[in-house]
Interface confidence: low
Amino acid sequence: QIDLNITCRFAGVFHVEKNGRYSISRTEAADLCKAFNSTLPTMAQMEKALSIGFETCRYGFIEGHVVIPRIHPNSICAANNTGVYILTSNTSQYDTYCFNASAPPEEDCTSVTDLPNAFDGPITITIVNRDGTRYVQKGEYRTNPEDIYPSNPTDDDV
């Protein structure tokens, strides 16, 4: 069973958290975004999302970096920094950010109901939207499924 908590999309960029903890590798992040018909965002795409109101308090993969987008300073989020804060001391597992090029150019908070590009598989995947709505499907999104249950998930605090 996998729970994927996802946010609203801001200029196509959104945050995905798996099973309530940092548990996504960079390889899995790319696979997961692909399953959402998305890609890992570029820094420019993340900065655009930030400019229209996107912020989180979770480290996640983008293309080439692990970041937290911050608008308001908060001592427990990105060490009080604002902007797209880049983590320098990387470990292996975080959340991920994804970019959907067909999303509206502004903020889109309608519920995501499925993983459109997932393929057949036995795993129960639950998509949890920010408004609490949950959608369940069976499937798989990994190209490297042996890594589905990481033997050593990190549970870092931000």
Epitope: C8, G53, C57, P104, E107, D108, C109, S111, D131, G132
Partner: antibody, heavy 117, light 108 residues
Framework: QVQLVQSGAEVKKPGASVKVSCKAS????????MHWVRQAPGQRLEWMGW????????KYSQKFQGRVTITRDTSASTAYMELSSLRSEDTAVYYC??????????WGQGTLVTVSS | EIVLTQSPGTLSLSPGERATLSCRAS???????LAWYQQKPGQAPRLLIY???SRATGIPDRFSGSGSGTDFTLTISRLEPEDFAVYYC?????????FGGGTKVEIK
């Protein structure tokens, strides 16, 4: 600016139905789910359900399942909440709300529904 | 259903004082999907905090939220006259979405 404007107060008899409207402006209506929440006098806020304004999908609180229907008219940027089989304990202020966005969480001004024989 | 219990029910304080409001959940709130609202008589609730600790647009920095799992706190660092109101917590990590019973912050 973003605004949700609700229809006016209603007085209904027990067993009747009421339909409250919520007109949205200042943003793309179909980009956000719309929720309905009620507040009986002196009581806590109570979530009733939501509609995905993009595709029309709805989700209702089990407490109201079968009595509440939430719909939308995208051409009018308006959401509707209809509650049937009214009883006196349904007397409350009913709010529409656009939840959880980085740009804030606008609510309608509220619609007082009084159920009285 | 996640039940949210707020305490205290009423908080009597003077302007300039610090207010600490508590919200306890009957089970863990998914991904800290917890919000705080302020409500004044005759008005709709106003979002203060979402995601347990993120301030909504236009909310003064004297309001701050913290916590995770089952225990959450709203802190108002220095009460202004306009802050005297009822405050509600709400979880939106699982359906049905639920609200706490509220804490009334009144002038001492």
């Amino acid at each position: 600016q973003v605004q949700l404007v609700q229809s006016g107060a209603e007085v209904k008899k027990p067993g009747a139905s009421v339909k409250v409207s919520c007109k949205a402006s200042g943003y793309t209506f179909t980009n956000y789910a719309m929720h309905w929440v009620r507040q009986a006098p002196g009581q806590r806020l109570e979530w009733m359900g939501w509609i995905n304004t993009g595709n029309g999908n709805t989700k209702y609180s089990q407490k109201f399942q079968g009595r509440v229907t939430i719909t939308r008219d995208t051409s009018a940027s308006t959401a509707y909440m209809e509650l049937s089989s009214l009883r006196s304990e349904d007397t409350a202020v009913y709010y529409c709300a656009r939840f959880y966005s980085g740009s804030g969480s606008p609510w309608g001004q509220g619609t007082l529904v009084t159920v009285s024989s | 259903e996640i039940v949210l219990t707020q305490s205290p029910g009423t908080l009597s304080l003077s302007p300039g004082e610090r207010a600490t409001l508590s919200c306890r959940a009957s089970q863990s709130v998914s991904s800290s999907y917890l919000a705080w609202y302020q409500q004044k008589p005759g008005q709709a609730p106003r979002l203060l905090i979402y995601g347990a600790s993120s301030r909504a647009t236009g909310i003064p920095d004297r309001f701050s939220g913290s916590g995770s799992g089952t225990d959450f706190t709203l802190t108002i660092s220095r009460l202004e006259p306009e802050d005297f109101a009822v405050y509600y917590c709400q979880q939106y990590g699982s359906s049905p979405l639920t609200f706490g019973g509220g804490t009334k912050v009144e002038i001492k």
